[in-house]
């Protein structure tokens, strides 16, 4: 039995002393306006949709809507006694961008579209960001333009940051033991979570822990290995706190950012810094995905916050923390890329759309300049004597690059007889050629290596 605590006294006339769920009338499976509580606060009923009449005998408005009379006064007991009907109006009036790439006039319209979508057994529409899908919006009064309140930002976003744990099976007993952990962040109230693809590698069992300690088994919904983004889902009753995606394209070098993660149960780790470079060419950093840019930051990104959000001072996600790839330099996958991934993921699930293939060898690299070469030489005594080429930061396991014998710290100096000056040169050749005969400087040796790019889903 439910108590009626919290129900306002004027509405209590004719209501039972105690709520009895068994007495509630059966409800249809789908409600156009979403669900609401009846006047007594006892039963869940179908709420009236936006624009529908409310008050009097009309019943309550649906989720996120409020009953407003013609002069804009919210309906109350007094209004009801004067026998005036109101209209259901969305409590939120700003436009929002949905994961289906549509702009909705307000949050209520997006929720209505999401309910329609689910009724048709399509994926729900989730909020990607405040404001219209295509446009920028600069708010000069926002925190990010006025203050550096890191703790406020953390307090605001922490509830939507989750701890992700992976389990492996022991070889013979097949018992599951924890093997690794990372972070992620919630992007939809019904439990969609974004993290790094590398956090959920190899079909391990994935467990998610929320800030309140609740744990859930997660299903992997979609993965983009190259972009290193994964979408996982937990089944949670009730609404979860979510983070909205900002526009990474609007980031300015020098802007404060906060990297947050949840490396341990019930605990967050926070690092802060500035944006060093806003659109560091993925072609340079090398790439799982040659046409992707990264955000470079001096905020420390490590195993603890990998997969978690990199946020601006408004608490909007402007990137996913990805691992630190070399001392003093950390990278994040930009939110614009996450939006693209979420929109395409929504599309794929809705339409089962075919995917065009891309060529891939499996390295992260960066263009070597004389200053970068000097910096690396100072750090590593055995760094090769070269001042240009493509410097390999990481060789991804089980890829053509690894099979061919490429190694971290190699410098690619030529491919198929053509000299390589930058990481772009490598990306261009990968697109064109089916076999790559590379000359690689390793230490002070030149080594011949053959790599056969593979075609993979983008």
């Amino acid at each position: 039995q439910l108590s009626r605590a919290g129900r306002s006294a004027p509405l209590a006339a004719g209501c039972p002393d105690r709520c009895e769920p068994a007495r509630c009338p059966p409800q249809p499976e789908h409600c156009e306006g979403g669900r609401a509580r009846d006047a007594c606060g006892c039963c869940e009923v179908c709420g009236a949709p936006e624009g529908a009449a409310c008050g009097l005998q009309e019943g309550p408005c649906g989720e996120g809507l409020q009953c407003v009379v013609p002069f804009g006064v919210p309906a109350s007991a007094t209004v009801r006694r004067r026998a005036q009907a109101g209209l259901c109006v969305c409590a939120s009036s700003e436009p929002v961008c949905g994961s289906d790439a549509n702009t909705y006039a307000n949050l209520c319209q997006l929720r209505a579209a999401s309910r329609r979508s689910e009724r048709l057994h399509r994926p729900p529409v989730i909020v990607l960001q405040r404001g219209a899908c295509g446009q920028g919006q600069e708010d000069p009064n926002s925190l990010r333009h006025k203050y550096n309140f890191i703790a406020d930002v953390v307090e605001k976003i922490a509830p939507a940051v989750v701890h992700i744990e992976l389990f492996r099976k022991l070889p013979f007993s097949k018992r599951e033991v924890p093997v690794a952990s990372g972070s992620g962040f919630i992007v939809s109230e019904d439990g969609l979570i974004v993290t790094n693809a590398h956090v959920v590698t190899n079909k391990h069992r994935v467990k998610v822990e929320l800030k309140n300690g609740a744990t859930y088994e997660a299903k992997i919904k979609d993965v983009d290995e190259k972009a290193d983004i994964a979408l996982i889902k937990i089944d949670h009753q009730g609404k979860l706190p979510v983070l909205l995606l900002g526009r990474s394209s609007e980031l300015r070098p020098g802007e404060f950012v906060v990297a947050i993660g949840s490396p341990f149960s019930l605990q967050n780790t926070v690092t802060t810094g500035i944006v060093s470079t806003t659109q560091r060419g993925g072609k340079e950093l090398g790439l799982r995905n040659s046409d992707m840019d990264y955000i470079q930051t001096d905020a420390i990104i490590n195993y603890g916050n990998s997969g978690g959000p990199l946020v601006n001072l408004d608490g909007e996600v402007i990137g996913i923390n990805t691992l630190k790839v070399t001392a003093g330099i950390s990278f994040a996958i930009p939110s614009d890329k996450i939006k693209k991934f979420l929109t395409e993921s929504h599309d794929r699930q809705a339409k089962g759309k075919a995917i065009t293939k891309k060529k891939y060898i499996g390295i992260r690299m960066m263009s070597l300049t004389s200053s970068k070469a000097k910096e690396l030489k100072d750090r590593h005594r055995d760094f090769p004597d070269v001042i240009s080429g493509a410097y390999i930061i990481e060789v991804i396991p089980d890829t053509p690059a690894e099979a061919g014998g490429l190694k971290e710290n190699d410098v690619i100096i030529s491919i198929n007889g053509q000299s390589v000056v930058s990481a772009n040169d490598v990306s261009d050749v990968i697109k064109r050629e089916s076999t790559l005969n590379m000359v690689v400087r390793r230490g002070n040796e030149d080594i011949m290596i053959t790599v056969i790019p593979e075609e993979i889903d983008p």
């Epitope: 492996r168 590698t201 190899n202 396991p397």
Partner: antibody
Amino acid sequence: QVQLVQSGAEVKKPGASVKVSCKASGYTFTDYEMHWVRQAPGQRLEWMGAIDPETGGTAYNQKFKGRVTITADKSASTAYMELSSLRSEDTAVYYCTREGYSYEGGGYYFDYWGQGTLVTVSS
Amino acid sequence: DIQMTQSPSSLSASVGDRVTITCSVSSSVSYMYWYQQKPGKAPKLLIYDTSNLASGVPSRFSGSGSGTDFTFTISSLQPEDIATYYCQQWSSYPTFGQGTKLEIK
């Protein structure tokens, strides 16, 4: 740091049994299987079997089935390997070794080894 | 059972030489592992998942291959590399190659 320390050398008569111990430290004993591998003089390494210390579940090489028993004492973080009905060809160095796991590739291997225990079977 | 054939069974090389050991298996495996064993000592893991260097292992050691044929290489032989090297696979259960004894000329 991870350490596996084995019991000392043994000399046994044919038909007898031997029990070798392996004390683990520096990691959570129940998070990894413990395996036993032997090496007869001039021979290749030979896997004998394994135990999950948490559950006591075991797996054995068919070649030794019925003669080898692997056990573990969680509270003492110690694994044991007992080989019965000894014969001269069981003369070998017996190693305990921890199962390692590659997070990236999902492969298994042996990452830490005990110092070895020489068991000599002679009449 | 998977049969493993490691070759050569012994080899002699000079300091600075490039040394290559091969391991063939009777049916395809996902990964190969390589160990170094010095006289009177336990084996030590050098290479995991075919080509990944184990922690603290010098970069002169490397591994490659796939399916049924795998290779272990020392790019420039050092005196301390004198040992016996074993390959190992782990499909249904672990098995080892017969070993390659490496000596200095």
